[in-house]
Amino acid sequence: EAHKSEIAHRYNDLGEQHFKGLVLIAFSQYLQKCSYDEHAKLVQEVTDFAKTCVADESAANCDKSLHTLFGDKLCAIPNLRENYGELADCCTKQEPERNECFLQHKDDNPSLPPFERPEAEAMCTSFKENPTTFMGHYLHEVARRHPYFYAPELLYYAEQYNEILTQCCAEADKESCLTPKLDGVKEKALVSSVRQRMKCSSMQKFGERAFKAWAVARLSQTFPNADFAEITKLATDLTKVNKECCHGDLLECADDRAELAKYMCENQATISSKLQTCCDKPLLKKAHCLSEVEHDTMPADLPAIAADFVEDQEVCKNYAEAKDVFLGTFLYEYSRRHPDYSVSLLLRLAKKYEATLEKCCAEANPPACYGTVLAEFQPLVEEPKNLVKTNCDLYEKLGEYGFQNAILVRYTQKAPQVSTPTLVEAARNLGRVGTKCCTLPEDQRLPCVEDYLSAILNRVCLLHEKTPVSEHVTKCCSGSLVERRPCFSALTVDETYVPKEFKAETFTFHSDICTLPEKEKQIKKQTALAELVKHKPKATAEQLKTVMDDFAQFLDTCCKAADKDTCFSTEGPNLVTRCKDALA
């Protein structure tokens, strides 16, 4: 239904707290360099204005669209051109072009310092002094670093943060209470960020149809007892919610997500038997819980997929009649039977099925042509299964850090032109798949591994798009989203690459490395490893292991030495010489 004042409607639906949080996220995701105070001021002005519209929907400007209202606010910021360069040109445009322009200027890798967590006492003091401002800072800092973070889900993480601080700041040992809990939230939030970015990429590059196909597969796996009409309705609603969030319409997105959660909870009987515990929770927790609810038990009497999609005499007629609906039912039927497959794999199978019908239905004897289609799925299914087995075996043998290093070597050989920080970040993220997925039961490994890898590789593609340097990466990133992971997996050593010359300073370290946290130490060592591979792309695993073991030994020795500086300055050059010899 149309509302006289869109801003009043959203304020009423969402309530002041969520309204303010979402407006802050929106502004922080659009203008990523502005300080918290600048954004907080704008948020307060927008909120005050919304309240006047709630009191009188006919008041001046209350009938304006949210894009117009928010865009006008952003464009009124002083020194916009000095701070944001050509983004200021967006302000010369009219809606909807102005909003599109803002979206195009979102930076997936803003040059902001890493978000450092203050020490426990300081954190608790500022939290107790002003919890609202404290949480505002959290929303601002996360949103500006992750400009596509799923806004209603960020509100959920802020709520988690709040609960942890409330609990731990009352403890005697605040540090040991806070650290593991906040680390857990951070890890989950980072995964949520790359997953959502993947959804927005799907929407931006391939449109709503592609996202809806993803949603149909995912929902069919989770709700195998829901019928196709129900799955289609949920997928349509979910597509709308994600389209809004990816498009910067965060108030509409959060409002529609709440509506979808309400609908699901009111229609549990036709959706799933597993929803009740989620539906008993308050809004943010409820929506989060529904998004990762366990799969319902599969119906016992599902007929073989071949009956309707291969053996039926009407296959080509049904396909001709309504291509998207027929392919949608295929995707639904296949997905509900295979919670053990990744969504990416299910979409590849649906694509293969579509291509087979396109070819076969144009032949004189289609049934003879498409009769073997299910057998042709076999290699497509085996490939990711082998990937999971190989990688989980390697992870179990090497542990997370060693597994990250193996991936780092592999990916540096595939794309040595990519910057070392990007390679290290990608390898560390890809390597976490082991900890995240390889410990799961067998039937959950494949979906976990492949869908997580796809999301991480999407980030690699986004960063590479900014400065394209590798033809290998460009090739894999140019194809469809579901083909990316197999494309990257199939890449081998880039034969066109001219090895980097050996620079001693790249492998020269100082005593300050000794005081770094373990994570930072690992990153330093992994940076050196990537540089070694760039110097010797065809070095054997054995050679690289020898050098890295030597390097680890050197760090251990010098960091324990009484005179660390002397140790580093005398033993360092010896290490460099040994490295050169080992790789010769």
């Epitope: 396909y319 009649e321 032949e363 004189a364 004897n365």
Partner: nanobody, 115 residues
């Protein structure tokens, strides 16, 4: 929605000829193979002939081989069946179908071969 409309049937003497047409709409005609299927009174459907989407590939039942010719005009979204040397056993309702199916979503056209 797929729609198929057959025409051209009628009464013909043994040894005579008829040309059946089938006008198609509601889908991308050239992307689908098409067939003629017939059903004699009191019998099940019997496949007669098929043609690929491009028209380059054709198949015939043994009972009509050498007498019937299937063709199509993709610019007109129309399928044809040229029937020569007709016999009394060719008497049936003739249907056009999509993609090798034996389904009958259309009315069909009656062909009667009798002296």
């Amino acid at each position: 929605e797929v729609q198929l409309l057959e025409s051209g049937g009628g009464l013909v003497q043994p040894g005579g000829s008829l040309r059946l047409s089938c006008a198609a709409s509601g889908f991308t005609f050239r992307s689908f193979g098409a067939s003629w299927v017939r059903q004699a009174p009191g019998k099940g459907p019997e496949w007669v002939s098929s043609i690929s989407g491009s028209g380059s590939d054709t198949l015939y039942a043994d009972s009509v081989k050498g007498r019937f010719t299937i063709s199509r005009d993709n610019s007109k979204n129309t399928l044809y069946l040229q029937m020569n040397s007709l016999r009394p056993e060719d008497t049936a309702v003739y249907y056009c179908t999509i993609g090798g199916s034996l389904s009958r979503s259309s009315q069909g056209t009656l062909v009667t071969v009798s002296s």
